[in-house]
């Protein structure tokens, strides 16, 4: 607890101190008082620099004095023989003896007092920026006219903050200008312009005249810009150091000026206008400005246009351009928007073909599409090759943005038929050399794939069964083998206008127009064991003449047995109808003359007993393309015959290929065309 | 050359079991049905149970059915036919035949064209 | 089940007679039936399948006919190797039944 006075006695005092004692006082007085500490009796073993015995006093860090020896007072009025005056509230005083005397030593006594301090002469440091008044106990500030005391109740400064400009123009300039400005102070001046304006300060070189930098290059009195989080300066010296024209990017700006005690100059003067934000004019690759300007300012507006194979994307819709506003921040609006390279996105996949997975969908790539070779080729053309186009689609020379579309190569079996005796007379075959080859088991009978969605037959076969089960890709039809072949399900039977329908259809003399269509549910897969044979052409090239050879197959009849279980094959010539004719035939249903004969059926066999049978109906007669030797075409139809092993009746195929292509487009579905 | 080899018969008690085999060569075996038909000494010939290519259908006559039952292994080229709760009039000689199967959804049986030479089975306390 | 009826139960002959054996079924079988000759101590073998079509390798001495319900195996002119039980196989539904079997022995 600080007190105004005491005393500080050595021990055993006025006896002989102790050997070996070190004994310290921390004496304090009230704040705003120093200490005068006095010795009226001083009696320590002298030693040089004290260094046996002494009292030492300290003040703060720094030692005040340390003393030793017998000492008497100058002044016979005073008895004071050592004396200390420290203007602080602090002090300490130790005491050190050390394990000896020779003589016997008395010590000392002292004491002090709370006295008095000048804060305003006794320190290097001048508590007052400008007038200093002592009191006992303390000391207190006061500023000239005009000055205001800070809140730290040492400095004095003039009232110069606070102004607030908002007009798009203005001057300021410092206190007193062009008169010196005051010391010690710090003027804050606000410019809060509307956004979209940016403050733009201009000052003349002469109009500035600031207290200039030491010589470590620190400005002692400063006039510094804030804009945001730049800033522009501190500026001093006599001429404006900084541009003339600071363009601070910004509607709001802060005027800092702060001085020193020292160095009073005429201070400065600055102009200051809004200009609508600049916002820059960006580089955005692959695009188009309009309008073109050399300057954009707030609320300008422009329609960002990409090039040709660039959009812009947006969430998940692409356009081809958008609008940016220049903004009161001095930046352009939808800025993230880019004009990117236009993607086509991965190429559609086609059915019966494939396209390559494309390194790039993006504008300018290329894809080349292709059919599964040898089954299917590219019926409209163009190449399969697509490119990327600027519209976002993938885009053939030929057909622009319309797939390819791979269809069936038709009557190509991938093994030739080689005779080796069976069918009636016929060979064993396999259905690689038929692959066309149909097989209905109710009833036991043949058709013949024409395409994916259609197989050809006999009208005789479907029309005690409208709904057929089919099989390709088996030469052999054990129950075993077709479980694991293709069934194909039909959709509709399209049996021919002409044909005449019976009440009892196994009384049947005329077979005329013995041709049906069945549409399929779904469509066939080709490959080396299914696919279809070619219609035949409308020319004269399609007429067959006499001799001319045609293949047939199926499961039918043999001379071993009633169903063959694999397939057989013959290499049939075509002859004369009347040839057919001459036949008797074999287990007449009726009269041998009503048997009818027309120019819609060929005549065909007769060679080696080679022929069809019961169970081969509708089941091609294949003969070559005399314009494509590598094809096969469907001449004709296994319909009827007088006697199996002479000659058959055969539908004569080019008389309803009109029929064919017209029942075929009518009753197509939109995935076929 | 097409065989069939029956296999498993025997003297076996009433009531009691016997598992007969049919070993199948000389033809694809899972192409075609299977059939077993006896003889009893001196009698005519009775079919007992058909079993289709791939084992997915089976027949039965009257008499032995839910004692008897058909089965294959195609990967094996075997046919069987376990017999159980057996009873003297079972006395017999059993023959497997093979059936061929033509046709898809409407088929064509074609039954018995080739037979085995048959293994006997003795039912007799 | 379909019954099969066979007759006569037995016969004898000549070499060289025309023989006749009849079945008939208890209900209409279409043409789902087949011949079978069985010689004694031998194996049952196909002549006839799907009422008259000749098994591959028999003599064309055999022959069949017939749909519905009555079915008839005629052997043209016998031969002494045609000595033999011949027995008729309905296949047209489960389960398949034989007809009792007619023995042709020498006259």
């Known amino acids: 607890e600080p007190t105004m006075y005491g005393e500080i006695l050595s021990p055993n005092y006025p006896q002989a101190y102790p050997s070996e004692v070190e004994k310290s006082w921390d004496i304090e007085v009230p704040e705003g008082y120093g200490i005068h500490l006095y010795f009226t009796h001083l009696d320590i073993e002298l030693s040089e620099n004290c260094a046996y015995d002494s009292v030492q006093i300290i003040s703060g860090d720094t030692e005040e004095g340390r003393l030793c020896g017998q000492r008497s007072s100058n002044n016979p009025h005073s008895p004071i023989v050592e004396e200390f005056q420290v203007p602080y509230n602090k002090l300490q005083v130790i005491f050190k003896s050390d394990f000896s005397n020779e003589e016997r030593f008395t010590g000392f006594a002292a004491y002090y007092v709370a006295t008095d301090i000048n804060e305003c002469t006794d320190f290097v440091d001048v508590p007052c920026s400008h007038f200093c008044n002592n009191f006992i106990g303390g000391y207190f500030c006061s500023c000239p006219p005009e000055y205001f005391l800070h809140d730290d109740m040492k400095n004095c400064g003039v009232n110069c903050s606070g102004d607030v400009f908002t007009a798009l123009i203005g001057e300021i300039a410092s206190p007193n200008y062009p008169k010196p400005y005051p010391e010690n102070s710090r003027c804050e001046y606000q410019i809060r312009l509307e956004k979209g304006f940016q403050v733009v300060v201009t000052l003349r070189r002469e109009d500035f005249d600031v207290e200039a930098a030491d010589s470590a290059g620190n400005c002692l009195d400063s006039l510094v810009f804030v804009a945001g989080d730049r800033q522009f300066g501190p500026y001093c010296g006599h001429g404006f150091p900084g541009p003339l024209n600071i363009e601070t990017k910004s509607n709001a700006l802060d005027i800092i000026f702060q001085t020193d005690l020292t160095g009073q100059k005429k201070g400065w003067k600055l102009r200051y206008h809004g200009d609508p934000m600049p916002c820059p004019k960006e580089d955005t690759p692959n695009s188009v400005w309009e309008p073109a300007k050399a300057k954009y300012v707030f609320r300008d507006v422009v329609q960002i246009t990409c090039l040709d194979g660039f959009e812009v994307v947006e969430g998940r819709v692409g356009a081809t351009s958008f609008y940016s506003t220049c903004q009161s921040n001095g930046k352009w609006s939808n800025s993230k928007l880019k004009c990117q390279p236009v993607d086509c996105g991965i190429p559609e996949s086609i059915e019966n073909g494939k396209v390559e997975d494309p390194e790039s969908t993006l504008f300018g790539s290329v894809i080349r599409y292709t059919c599964e070779e040898p089954y299917y080729y590219m019926e409209n053309g163009g190449g399969g090759e697509y490119h990327c186009a600027g519209n976002g689609s993938w885009v053939n020379e030929v057909l622009g943005p319309e797939l390819p579309k791979c269809v069936p190569v038709c009557g190509v079996p991938r093994e030739p038929f080689e005779e080796k005796q069976r069918i009636i007379g016929g060979s064993d075959a396999d259905i690689k050399n038929f692959p066309w080859q149909v097989f209905f088991d109710n009833p036991w009978a043949g058709g013949a794939l024409i395409n994916e969605y259609w197989v050809l037959t006999a009208a005789h076969v479907v029309e005690g069964n409208r709904e057929p089960t089919m099989y390709v890709g088996s030469t052999s039809v054990q129950t075993s083998r077709l479980a694991k072949s293709k069934m194909l399900t039909p959709e509709h039977v399209f049996i021919h206008p002409g044909w005449k329908l019976l009440e009892v259809p196994e009384g049947r003399t005329n077979f005329d127009n013995d041709i049906a269509l069945v549409r399929l549910k779904d469509p066939v897969k080709m490959g080396p064991t299914v696919s279809p044979i070619c219609l035949p052409g409308t020319s004269s090239d399609y007429n067959l003449m006499d001799g001319d050879l045609g293949l047939i197959s199926g499961w039918g009849r043999t001379e071993k047995r009633d169903r063959a279980v694999r397939l057989k094959a013959a290499r049939l010539p075509v002859a004369p109808l009347r040839k057919c004719k001459e036949v008797k035939v074999e287990k007449p249903t009726a009269d041998a003359e009503a048997y009818v004969f027309t120019p819609n059926m060929i005549c065909a066999g007769g060679e080696k007993g080679m022929d069809s049978c019961k169970g081969d109906s509708g089941g091609a007669f294949a003969v070559q393309d005399p314009n494509d030797k590598t094809k096969f075409y469907a001449a004709g139809l296994v319909s009827w015959g007088p006697q199996c092993g002479t000659y058959g009746l055969y539908t004569r195929v080019k008389n309803y290929v009109d029929w064919i292509m017209k029942t075929m487009q009518e009753n197509s579905t939109p995935r076929e065309d | 050359e097409v065989q069939l080899v029956e296999s498993g018969g025997g003297v076996v008690r009433p009531g009691g079991s016997l598992r007969l085999s049919c070993a199948a060569s000389g033809f694809t075996f899972d192409d075609y049905g299977m059939s077993w038909v006896r003889q009893a000494p001196g009698k005519g010939l009775e079919w007992v149970s058909g079993i289709n290519w791939e084992g997915g259908s089976t027949g039965y006559a009257d008499s032995v059915k839910g004692r008897f039952s058909i089965s294959r292994d195609n990967a094996k080229n075997s046919l069987y036919l376990q017999m159980n709760s057996l009873r003297a009039e079972d006395t017999a000689l059993y023959y497997c035949?093979?059936?061929?199967?033509?046709?898809?959804?409407?088929?064509?049986?074609?039954?018995?064209?080739?037979w085995g030479k048959g293994t006997t089975v003795t039912v007799s306390s | 089940d379909i019954q099969m009826t066979q007759s006569p139960s037995s016969l004898s002959a000549s070499v060289g007679d025309r023989v006749t054996i009849t079945c008939r079924a208890s209900?209409?079988?279409?043409?789902?039936l087949g011949w079978y000759q069985q010689k004694p101590g031998k194996a049952p073998k196909r002549l006839i399948y799907?009422?008259?079509n000749l098994q591959s390798g028999v003599p064309s001495r055999f022959s069949g006919s017939g749909s519905g319900t009555e079915f008839t195996l005629t052997i043209s002119s016998l031969q002494p190797e045609d000595f033999a039980t011949y027995y008729c196989l309905q296949t047209n539904i489960y389960p398949l039944t034989f007809g009792g079997g007619t023995k042709v022995e020498i006259k």
């Open positions: 799907t009422a008259s």
């Open positions: 209900q209409g079988i279409r043409n789902d």
């Open positions: 035949a093979r059936d061929e199967q033509l046709g898809g959804l409407k088929y064509y049986y074609y039954y018995m064209d080739v």
